[in-house]
Interface confidence: medium
């Protein structure tokens, strides 16, 4: 989608100072949907736009993480910024029920984890708790303390996959199954994708 | 078309060893997870595990753990499963089936050998 | 592991009826449940995938819908070919399970 990402982040440099530390305080209280988790407020309060555009989508991908900021903007007034994310989310949804086929018509071959593994290591976040999950069954001492020891998250995914190669099937199923209680809507994104 | 073809009916005697067969065609079979499921009469579906015959590796559920023992054999495209120390408990329905697509661990099994029909009595 | 809880366990309809067939997982499973529907003597066959994709081949009248713990099947327009028992499946993570079955006949 690419596109939804960009018309979050256009809005939100869009917004003042005090109009994007108010989008933050409303972010904070809004109604989400179910299974959906918060941005905490510690890390919401001190983000600029590039990296609360980066939150909302790793939080709410971009489908929802789009819908959540219209809603918001709505709230605080700003119809006209809402009404332009509006239109990216009709033509983003045009394109995708353009492109989407159904699964089982497409002989995909490889494993969730070797296809999407750009998208995973840009997109997942909370790392730790993949890892306490592969430590000891998957992931040796050494290679979770090697991960643990990259700064941010792509560096820790990045290392968690040079890992990847020597690892059978029900490995890679084992970091799968990880995902999906941890990102679980980043897993039925990218199974959409 | 895709078509996994079970072997026999088989009647053991507790304490003995069993080994049934699931022959697979109509894809390759190294691309696919088996899985293997059974009934027992009156009961619900329960998984109890698969073999991936592209690497050899298996996951098993932790109650057939020692119970249930998967293999495969790529030159004969069959995939098996040898259950040990029957009890009574053992009588069932087993079944291999495959999923709808490899892509992931979402298993959907959209076909089925015929099962294989296992009953442990003295 | 997650425990799946069909209801009802056996259900009596009568031709062109609606039914729903309810199954409740004992935690999140998000959309990752499937159905499944066995005639006697016969071998599963899957209905329904990701909670509402309908499998190639299988009668519109079938639908299925929910996400997180609660999930229906819902067969609309009953026909004599659908007494079956059926069963729900989470693919949210190992060990598989399934439900304990919902027996369908008709009055």
């Known amino acids: 989608m690419g596109r939804a990402r960009d018309a979050i982040l256009d809005a939100l440099e869009n917004l003042s100072g005090d109009e994007l530390k108010k989008f933050k305080m409303k972010l904070l209280t809004v109604q989400l949907r179910e299974g959906y988790g918060r941005i905490p407020r510690g890390a919401l309060l001190q983000m600029d736009a590039i990296d609360l555009t980066d939150k909302l989508v790793s939080y709410y991908l971009e489908s929802y993480g789009l819908e959540l900021t219209m809603t918001v903007l709505r709230d605080m007034g700003l119809q006209e910024l809402a009404e332009q994310l509006q239109t990216t989310k009709e033509e983003s949804g045009a394109v995708a029920a353009a492109a989407s086929v159904p699964a089982q018509s497409t002989a995909r071959t490889g494993h969730f984890v070797d296809q999407h593994r750009q998208a995973l290591i840009a997109r997942v976040t909370e790392v730790d708790g993949v890892l306490d999950a592969l430590h000891g069954s998957v992931l040796t001492e050494g290679q979770y303390q090697a991960v643990r020891a990259e700064t941010t998250s792509q560096d820790k995914m990045r290392k968690l996959f040079s890992f990847v190669p020597s690892w059978n099937l029900t490995c890679k199923d084992s970091l799968l199954q990880a995902l999906k209680e941890i990102h679980p809507y980043l897993v039925m994104d990218l199974e959409q994708s | 078309q895709v078509q996994l073809q079970q072997s026999d009916a088989e009647l053991v005697k507790p304490g003995a060893s069993v080994k049934i067969s699931c022959k697979i065609s109509g894809y390759t079979f190294t691309d696919q997870t088996i899985h293997w499921m059974n009934q027992r009469p009156e009961q619900g579906l329960e998984w109890i595990g698969y073999i991936y015959p592209g690497d050899g590796s298996a996951m098993y559920n932790e109650k057939f753990r020692g119970k249930a023992t998967l293999t495969a054999d790529k030159s004969s495209s069959t995939a098996y499963m040898q259950l040990n120390s029957l009890t009574s408990e053992d009588s069932a329905v087993y079944f291999c089936?495959?999923?709808?697509?490899?892509?992931?661990?979402?298993?959907?099994?959209?076909?089925w050998g015929q099962g294989t029909l296992v009953t442990v009595s003295a | 592991d997650i425990q799946m809880n069909q209801s009802p366990s056996s259900l009596s309809a009568s031709l062109g009826d609606t039914i729903t067939i309810t199954c409740h997982a004992s935690?999140?499973?998000?959309?990752?449940l499937s159905w499944y529907q066995r005639k006697p003597g016969n071998i599963p066959k899957l209905l329904i995938y990701k909670s509402s994709n309908l499998h190639t081949g299988v009668p519109s009248r079938f639908s299925g819908s929910g996400s997180g713990t609660g999930f229906t099947l819902t067969i609309s327009s009953l026909q004599p070919e659908d007494i079956a028992t059926y069963y729900c499946q989470q693919g949210q993570s190992y060990p598989l399970t399934f439900g304990g079955g919902t027996k369908l006949e008709i009055k």
């Open positions: 089936a495959r999923p709808l697509y490899s892509y992931a661990s979402y298993y959907w099994f959209a076909y």
């Open positions: 935690q999140n499973i998000n959309v990752w």
